[in-house]
Interface confidence: low
Amino acid sequence: QRLPRMQEDSPLGGGSSGEDDPLGEEDLPSEEDSPREEDPPGEEDLPGEEDLPGEEDLPEVKPKSEEEGSLKLEDLPTVEAPGDPQEPQNNAHRDKEGDDQSHWRYGGDPPWPRVSPACAGRFQSPVDIRPQLAAFCPALRPLELLGFQLPPLPELRLRNNGHSVQLTLPPGLEMALGPGREYRALQLHLHWGAAGRPGSEHTVEGHRFPAEIHVVHLSTAFARVDEALGRPGGLAVLAAFLEEGPEENSAYEQLLSRLEEIAEEGSETQVPGLDISALLPSDFSRYFQYEGSLTTPPCAQGVIWTVFNQTVMLSAKQLHTLSDTLWGPGDSRLQLNFRATQPLNGRVIEASFPAGVDSSPRAAEPVQLNSCLAAGD
């Protein structure tokens, strides 16, 4: 069931209020963005649960087995043993065997390329999306999600890892980007700003949204996350922008109402299973897609990003709760946990719908500068 929490069809780029790049780092929307400092202060991205290997936190959940054999995600070296949620395990920055990405933060030292050389790669994320320059690709079919409606028990782990709030997902959540492009959901996490300062990672024509949700998936072609890192299509992230709306979003409230319990960095709690798909926009047919990277160290490339055209609506109070409840490292508030947009360096963003025609109110007439590259896969 879909809640009336979504803007019926809010095309990205349809001027909503909010500063462009509140941190003074103008996210240049041109496709020829010149490379910038890897991650200007306050504009970087986060890993996850244990500073896992990428897009925020590559999780502790494994994918469901496939017909050819049981593929599964073996926990990466950064996953820790169970602990008590009331005894915060402040290990977001501790050294872990086999984990080169333990020490990084948003803004300041060390520079991310020093943490992981891949962070200086040419095809990084997030990026600025310019609908006018997107290539309409009819081969991009509606996304398919299966098993995302979870029963209340067993409960799921919700953790403040010092970089974000992350919900670890159980086995069995299947997602298909198209025929033969099947994935298993691993975890989801959020990026946000601060009071009056939007904090989405991706931007649309330079516009930054209040917040952004990422649902991280592992391709069924790989048994483990570490195998998939850096491999084209090995990981896929579904991303949606969160905007302010008039009503409380009941799906998000199931998570936001628990944030006070995990205010301290490293703390965690359990939340009842919920309909994960209710956290996403209802329109699975209209989206942008491109190949990029994890937005946190190790910044591995080859990640397929799918950014929904429709946004998700949260109340002002909910957005405030998200940005003003959690604490990060060093007794600092966990805020502005987003990475600066990265240059496209010749990449073409594809759209599953004619975005250049009907999605940008700034266009005087239909324009389509790029052609679809995804010849039907």
Epitope: E60, S65, D75, P152, L153, E155, Q270
Partner: antibody
Framework: ELVESGGGLVQPGGSLRLSCAAS????????MNWVRQAPGKGLEWVSG????????YYADSVKGRFTISRDNSKNTLYLQMNSLRAEDTAVYYC??????????WGQGTLVTVSS | DIELTQPPSVSVAPGQTARISCSGD??????VHWYQQKPGQAPVLVIY???NRPSGIPERFSGSNSGNTATLTISGTQAEDEADYYC?????????FGGGTKLTVL
């Protein structure tokens, strides 16, 4: 720490209420479960309850006879057992179970159903 | 509901490797946890999420899970490892245990 109490000898058809006092972790944040073990037998999950009591689950063998509940203000988990049968004789453990297994188990309390 | 099947007993000589299996339909798509239980004591978690050791559990304990079978492996088995071992998983809100395996160290 989890400490069970309330076990004892009861006749078939009788009732018993088990309690589990929790300490050392944030009880109100956690789903809780009862697991039992008949003498010389294996572990059998009995019932589970969400952190806020909104959801309860039961094994088929006890459905309709047992009721799980909790009082977060007292950090206590309960299991009300009615219409007891001989096959309910077991050590009853309360346990905190999540996708990452049992973080904690109590030491158990013995329930004996016999005439 | 998923059913977990374990062998009733496994014997191993000290210093050798013990393997305890847990089978169930499509078990590889579920997380499996393993508990050790010694007489008169509560169960102790030794492996969680198929192959992860909680702190305090010796490195000789390891786990795997694929296809229809999960396996608990104890390398260099010691006398103190003699105990009952149970696999456990979840199936839509219900907790499921295997029947248990008695490990005898000869």
């Amino acid at each position: 720490e989890l400490v069970e109490s309330g076990g004892g000898l009861v006749q078939p058809g009788g009732s018993l209420r088990l309690s589990c006092a929790a300490s050392g972790f944030t009880f109100s944040n956690n789903a809780m479960n009862w697991v039992r073990q008949a003498p010389g037998k294996g572990l059998e999950w009995v019932s589970g309850i969400s952190y806020d009591s909104s959801k309860t689950y039961y094994a088929d063998s006890v459905k309709g006879r047992f009721t799980i509940s909790r009082d977060n203000s007292k950090n206590t988990l309960y299991l009300q057992m009615n219409s007891l049968r001989a096959e309910d004789t077991a050590v009853y453990y309360c346990a905190r179970l999540t996708y990452t297994g049992a973080y904690r188990w109590g030491q158990g309390t013995l329930v004996t159903v016999s005439s | 509901d998923i059913e977990l099947t374990q062998p009733p007993s496994v014997s191993v000589a000290p210093g050798q490797t013990a393997r305890i299996s847990c089978s169930g339909d499509n078990l590889g798509s579920y997380y499996v946890h393993w508990y050790q239980q010694k007489p008169g004591q509560a169960p102790v978690l030794v492996i969680y999420d198929d192959n992860n050791r909680p702190s305090g559990i010796p490195e000789r304990f390891s786990g795997s899970n694929s296809g229809n079978t999960a396996t608990l492996t104890i390398s260099g088995t010691q006398a103190e490892d003699e105990a009952d071992y149970y696999c456990q998983s979840y199936d839509f809100g219900k907790v499921v245990f295997g029947g248990g395996t008695k490990l005898t160290v000869l």
